[in-house]
Structure formats: structure tokens, C-alpha cells
Interface confidence: low
Amino acid sequence: DAHKSEVAHRFKDLGEENFKALVLIAFAQYLQQCPFEDHVKLVNEVTEFAKTCVADESAENCDKSLHTLFGDKLCTVATLRETYGEMADCCAKQEPERNECFLQHKDDNPNLPRLVRPEVDVMCTAFHDNEETFLKKYLYEIARRHPYFYAPELLFFAKRYKAAFTECCQAADKAACLLPKLDELRDEGKASSAKQRLKCASLQKFGERAFKAWAVARLSQRFPKAEFAEVSKLVTDLTKVHTECCHGDLLECADDRADLAKYICENQDSISSKLKECCEKPLLEKSHCIAEVENDEMPADLPSLAADFVESKDVCKNYAEAKDVFLGMFLYEYARRHPDYSVVLLLRLAKTYETTLEKCCAAADPHECYAKVFDEFKPLVEEPQNLIKQNCELFEQLGEYKFQNALLVRYTKKVPQVSTPTLVEVSRNLGKVGSKCCKHPEAKRMPCAEDYLSVVLNQLCVLHEKTPVSDRVTKCCTESLVNRRPCFSALEVDETYVPKEFNAETFTFHADICTLSEKERQIKKQTALVELVKHKPKATKEQLKAVMDDFAAFVEKCCKADDKETCFAEEGKKLVAASQAALGL
């Protein structure tokens, strides 16, 4: 339904508060280096303009597209060229090329200072002094660091952020109340950002068909009682929502997401029995709840899949009639029967089925050709099952920190060209799969682990894409979305790698390490471990363990010393010499 003024339409649908928040997120995700005050000024100007259009949709410029209006506004920033360099060239383009240009310049790893959390009293004072500015600052800081964060979900995070301060700044022990809540929001926020980044990568790098296939599989697992037609409808709508958000169309995205939540709740009887509680919540909570809802129970007595997809004489006729629909039905039927499989495994099975039909439906005897297609699935299912079993055993044996270290060594040997901060970040996140998923029973382990690994490996892919240094990473990231994890798992030690020159400075530590949090100290040690492997890729596990144990003892000893700095200087030299000897450097 066409509207005379798109900006007026969205302002009315979303309301002023959400409109302003979403425009701020959009601007901060595009111009990640701009100061907060500049963004607030731009947002206020856009909001005032939107209000004139609400009053009179025929007013001047009210008929322009949102991309045109927002792009024109962004291009008024005076310091565009000195701050962003070639991104300023986007402003010479016309829509839609200009928006595409802005999207291409989004930076997954912007050069921004780490967010340091002030003292609780300082935060509470700032919150009470100007609640609106305080919350806007939160949106701005998250959006600029996470340029693909799912905007309507960020509104939900902001609502929880506000609730935390409202409650805890009145508490007797403000810190005990607030800090755990902020930690939880931070961790959930990072996870949410990474999950959305995979959705956007899927759409942008592999296309709508890839995203729709993922959505069919996931929604069929979640809503196994829903009919195929219902799942297809939800997939179409969900694809639209995510395409919009990934494309920077945040107002349309938030509006359509609200419509989808409304539709789901109005039709929950034909979708899932698990939606009742979600549907009683306010909009932002409702949408979040639906996105996280547990899988419904599988219908009883589902017939064998073989009847329609292997034994039927009409398989090739049905496939030829509407290939993607038939494959969609296969994926739907398989996924609703297998909540115990990861989505990526289900997609691999569907791909195998598709390849088999392509080959067999052109054969002399198609049925004989595809009769054993389900046998081809067995090794595909067993591979992730075995991998998860082995790694969960290793995790249970080592604990999270040492499990992360094992993965650090493993991945540094596979792709040693990748930057040390990226290897540390990605391996630490890969290692978190243990505490996240190994606690689950067998039936929940694979969907938890393999789909989480897909999210983490996508982080590696998007960071590597910015500065490509390894052909092996490029190959695993670009060849097949669903086979990324098996591709990385299959990589052996890179024999072509020339070890890094030894640099004593890399292994020089100071007393400041003693005041770091446990997490920061771990990161320091893990950074040293990656550097060790880059210097000595053929070092054995035992050699690396000995050096790391010595390193931990050295840090502990010097942090207890009276003259810490002298201890780090003197004992550090001894440690470097001993490590070189142990590793034969």
C-alpha cells in the first residue's frame, strides 16, 4: 500500500520515541566515527521534518524516499571526507547506489576506544540528571560498534538497560544490583549482534534463497505443528524484515517486525502452542520472546519421509514442477522431525537431496538412481555428532580456559596469517561452546553447538574480509555457507607458513597486568600463546603447556612481589630465555 509520504507513514506507525531511536541507530551504524552530539542534531532535524510531513503529507520533500532523506542528511556532515575518506564519495552518487555505497563502508571492527564502565554512582547520577540523553548515548555507543545490530532488538536492550538503572539506582547496594544486570546485557548484546551479523552475511553474500532455506529449517523445528503453507508465509515475512534491517531500512524493518509479531500472535493456534506467554507481553518483549521461543512438541505419528521423497514414483515430476517449493517441503518435513539436528546439518541434507535429484531425474531409471539417497545422509549426520562428542569430552577434561587454549593452538596452526587479536577473540568464542552446549542432553547438543559455531566462524569471516591475509580462510568463508564449519575443521597445519621472527617485546610484561580482571589477564596470556605458536608452529602440546605454566607462575610471582616492575623486568628476561630454550627458538 503506497503512502504519499513514507516518512510520515513510519513516524505515525512507530511513534516519536521509537522513530527517533531508530533514526539514531541508523545514523550511528552508517557514520560510526561521528560524535554523539552531531548525531543527536541530525536526528532532531529529521524528526522535526517528519512532523511537518505528518501535519501535511503534501509538504515539500515529504514524498521523498527514506534513503533519499537520510542520505541527504548524512551528506551534510561537514567533516565527512577527513573523517571517513573515500566514504565521502558515496555522496556524489544517486539513490539507490548511494545507500549501497554507505552499506559497503560499514566497518565490523571500527577503530573506537573500548567502552569503559564508569563507577556505579557516576552512572546513576548521569542517569538521573538526563535520562533521555543517557539512553540515547547507550543506543549510539552500541550501534556504532555493531553496525549490523538488529535495530528493533536494540530498542528492547535499551528498555532493559533503562529498567536496570531505574531499579538499581534506588537500591541499598547499587553495585550489587546493577553490575550483574549490565554484565548480562553486555554478554547477551554481543551474542545478539553476532547472530544478526550471520543473518546479514547470509543475505548479502549468499542471497535470499540461502536465508530462506535457513529460515524454513529453523521455523520448521520451532513450529513443527504448523503447516507448510504457514511456515512459508512466516519465512517470506521474516526474510523481508531481515533484508530491510541488513539493508539499513530500520524504520521499515521495525514496523514489519511488529506486524509479523501481531500476525503470529493472532494465528498462534495454527503455529505453536508455546506462544501464549510471549503474546501477552508488550511489543518489544513480545517480539524478543517469539524469536527465542522453545520448539513446540512434534506432532504424533508423522509418517515416514521416504514415502513422499523416495518411494513415490512422482518425485521427479513434483521436483520438476516447482523445484524450490519441493525442496522447501523436504526441508520442512525433515526439520520438523529433527529438532536434534543443527540447522546447518539440515541444509547439508537438503543440498545432498537436491544434488541427487538433479542427477537422477535426468537418468534412465530415476527411481533406481535416487532410491538410496537417504543412505548418503548417514555420514553427514555422524560427522558433527562425533566432533561434538570429542570436543565436549575435551572441554569436560580441561575446563573453559584450557579448552580455549587448545582451540587457540589448533586454529593458529590452521591459519597462522590471521591477526593475533582476531585469533584470540574467535578462539575464545569458539571455546565458549563448551559451557554453552556440552551441559545439554544429546538431543540438544548439536543444534546448540553447530549453529553457535556458525555464528562465531562468521565473525572470523567478516573480520578477515576487511583485511584478507589467508587464502584458506577466504576459501572456507566463501565456498559454502553451510559447510564453513566442516571446512575449517578439515584444515590441517599450514605447512606453507614461514614462522614469525622472534620479538622479545611481544613477551615483555609489566606490573599493570596485576590490576587487570581475570578475563583481561587470560586474554594477555592467550595473546602470548598465539604469538608463541606463530613463532614455533611445530611446537608440541607438551612444550606449549610447559611454557604457559611457567608464564602463569611468573605472573603470579611478580604480582606478589614488593617491587613488581623490577620483578617483571628481571624475571621476564629469564622466562623469555627459558622459553626460547624449551621451544628451540
Epitope: 508465509k233 512422482d314 515430476k317 513434483n318 514442477e321 517441503m329
Partner: nanobody, 123 residues
């Protein structure tokens, strides 16, 4: 839900013709396989004809082959059953059915949505 409404039934003499229509409304998301079934008094509901979503594939019960033709107009969300050379044994309540997917569905269990039926009497 998808609602199906049949029309076009009536009383006709043997050898005559009738054209049944079935229109889908409500949440009709393509692709829908459409089928016609019939049920004579005291008998089981039996398959008559089916048509795939694009109309590219048709299937008929042996008893009506060469006499009945199924077709569809997706723009109007309507499926038709043209019945020629009608015989007294064609007397029954005719039901329209729909199912999401593709394929020639010949069994009642394969269909999710059903119309109320329209009476056809051949004298």
C-alpha cells in the same frame, strides 16, 4: 485458515454437463495443490481429480478419465471441474480440497482444507 467454497452443483440429465467451481479465501499462500473428491450416500469419500499449483500436472481417477477436466485460475484463486457425459453413478456430494505443497495428491489424508461440498445429481 484457508476457506473453500464450492458452487455449480445441481440436477442434470444423464449425458449432460456441469462445471463446478471452488474458490479459496483467507490465508491462501501459494503453492496450494487443489483436489476434487466425491462421496455418494453410504460410500467412502473417493478421489476424483487433482491439479498442482502451477496447473502443470493433472491426475484423474480412472472412472472419470476422458470425461472430467480439472483446471485452475490462480489469479482468481479458483479451481474448476468440468464434468461432461455425466452418468447416474456420478451422483454424489462433490468436495473441493486444498493442501500446501506440490504433487498429485490422491488421498484424503494429504489434504488440510476442505469445502462444505456441493450436491450433483444425475437422473
Amino acid at each position: 485458515q484457508v476457506q473453500l467454497v464450492e458452487s455449480g452443483g445441481g440436477l442434470v440429465q444423464a449425458g449432460g454437463s456441469l462445471r463446478l467451481s471452488c474458490t479459496a479465501s483467507g490465508r491462501t499462500y501459494e503453492p496450494l495443490v487443489m483436489g476434487w473428491f466425491r462421496q455418494a450416500p453410504g460410500k467412502e469419500r473417493e478421489f476424483v481429480a487433482t491439479i498442482t499449483p502451477s496447473g502443470g500436472s493433472l491426475s484423474y481417477a480412472d472412472s472419470v478419465k476422458g470425461r472430467f477436466t480439472v483446471s485452475r485460475d490462480n489469479a482468481k484463486k479458483t479451481v474448476y471441474l468440468q464434468m461432461n457425459r455425466l452418468q447416474p453413478e456420478d451422483t454424489a456430494v462433490y468436495y473441493c480440497a486444498a493442501a500446501p505443497g506440490v504433487g498429485n495428491y490422491r488421498y484424503t489424508r494429504q489434504y488440510d482444507y476442505w469445502g462444505q461440498g456441493t450436491q450433483v445429481t444425475v437422473s
